[in-house]
């Protein structure tokens, strides 16, 4: 499911509950995706020794994974709500191609990988509703994404395993930073 359970105000388990505010819904959505990433990381780490590998730099050269930097205004010092929100949305849009890459990388967690991808799309929609300055959000070029995907899929097995591990780790870090920043707003 792209949305965590219990989101609906008609939820029978909690009829007394008020509907979630947009902030609560976004917070819950991020946590739902992070739970999914946790499950995927578990499979990745059990399947290979990538999680302990020190050769990450080799694979990292091929990737341009979104990262939070000081200038993005998402950290406590120099915090800027609008700049940060733009960074979070832009970063999530940039992660989409990497989440697409993950789709055929899991055996027992295939549904989980799909759920992470779909939930991220929903999260982007939630955040776009919250953002005032949508013009500042740059959408990745589909042609560039398509060639990147082809390039990643053409890597040897070891690099593909390492890429999977790096994507999950970076996406987890990005979402954790986003969660903290959104709570700070």
């Amino acid at each position: 499911a792209p949305v965590p359970p219990g989101e609906d105000s008609k939820d029978v388990a909690a009829p007394h509950r008020q509907p979630l505010t947009s902030s609560e819904r976004i917070d819950k959505q991020i946590r739902y995706i992070l739970d999914g990433i946790s499950a995927l990381r578990k499979e990745t780490c059990n399947k290979s020794n990538m999680c302990e590998s020190s050769k990450e730099a080799l694979a990292e050269n091929n990737l341009n994974l979104p990262k939070m930097a000081e200038k993005d205004g998402c950290f406590q010092s120099g915090f800027n709500e609008e700049t940060c929100l733009v960074k979070i949305i832009t970063g999530l849009l940039e992660f989409e191609v990497y989440l697409e890459y993950l789709q055929n990388r899991f055996e027992s967690s295939e549904e989980q990988a799909r759920a992470v991808q779909m939930s991220t799309k929903v999260l982007i929609q939630f955040l776009q509703k919250k953002a005032k300055n949508l013009d500042a959000i740059t959408t990745p070029d589909p042609t560039t994404n398509a060639s990147l995907l082809t390039k990643l899929q053409a890597q040897n097995q070891w690099l593909q395993d390492m890429t999977t591990h790096l994507i999950l780790r970076s996406f987890k870090e990005f979402l954790q930073s986003s969660l903290r920043a959104l709570r700070q707003m």
Epitope: T21, S23, E24, D27, K28, R31, L34, D35, S38, F75, Q76, S77, F79, E81, R180, A181, L182, R183, Q184, M185
Partner: antibody, heavy 120, light 107 residues
């Protein structure tokens, strides 16, 4: 030195209202999320409400949702808790606390508390 | 909502002893956990955040550990100033619930 000073506590009748304040000093108030936490006599701590630095993010405990409103005035370095429809179970010491994002929202500074008694 | 179960509710120990307080969450809270100390008539003080990181100025005899749903606070070689109440708090899901507390008394 970071300082948080709560005020506004006192005796209130059931069904009544009260507004608590928390004056902050010694840090850039507008850069930090803030919490209200309460403690009933001889009981444990209960998280009440949270507000982000720019007031866009506001969260409440289910026990106070719809009755309490957290707000802040950044230029005046002040945090507020407007309490309405007060009940006897709201009797407690109310603390304001600073939320440190770098410390995963943990409360790194607390005020000395202000006591609220709901009784007829 | 995720519930926090803290144990024991009370604990008697002597100066020099080592004590451990545990908190169990009803779901994975991904290390989003803090520990606080509160002395009688005083405000709580932050001891540990992110489950394992000691807050500024906290003596090294305190240590936090755990992951997933199980967390603990260990105090090595108890000092007289360590007696009081201890609380864990989750920061993963909302509400940011506290554990029920542990009252640490001098034996």
């Amino acid at each position: 030195d970071v300082q948080l000073v709560e005020s506004g506590g006192g005796l209130v009748q059931p069904g009544g209202s009260r507004k608590l304040s928390c004056a902050a000093s010694g840090f850039t108030f507008s850069s930090f999320g803030m919490h209200w936490v309460r403690q009933a006599p001889e009981k444990g701590l209960e998280w009440v409400a949270y507000i982000g630095s720019g007031s866009s993010t506001v969260y409440y405990a289910d026990t106070v949702k719809g009755r309490f409103t957290i707000s802040r005035d950044n230029p005046k370095n002040t945090l507020f808790l407007q309490m309405t429809s007060l009940r006897s179970e709201d009797t407690a010491m109310y603390y304001c606390a600073r939320s440190e994002t770098a410390r995963a929202e943990a409360m790194d500074y607390w005020g000395q508390g202000t006591s609220v008694t709901v009784s007829s | 909502d995720i519930q926090m179960t803290q144990s024991p509710a009370s604990l008697s120990a002597s100066v020099g002893e080592t004590v451990t307080i545990t908190c169990r969450a009803s779901g994975n809270i991904h290390n989003y956990l803090a520990w606080y100390q509160q002395k009688q008539g005083k405000s709580p003080q932050l001891l540990v955040y992110n489950a394992k990181t000691l807050a500024d100025g906290v003596p090294s005899r305190f240590s936090g550990s755990g992951s997933g749903t199980q967390y603990s606070l260990k105090i090595n070689s108890l000092q007289p100033e360590d007696f009081g109440s201890y609380y864990c708090q989750l920061f993963w899901s909302i509400p940011w619930t506290f554990g029920g507390g542990t009252k640490l008394e001098n034996k």
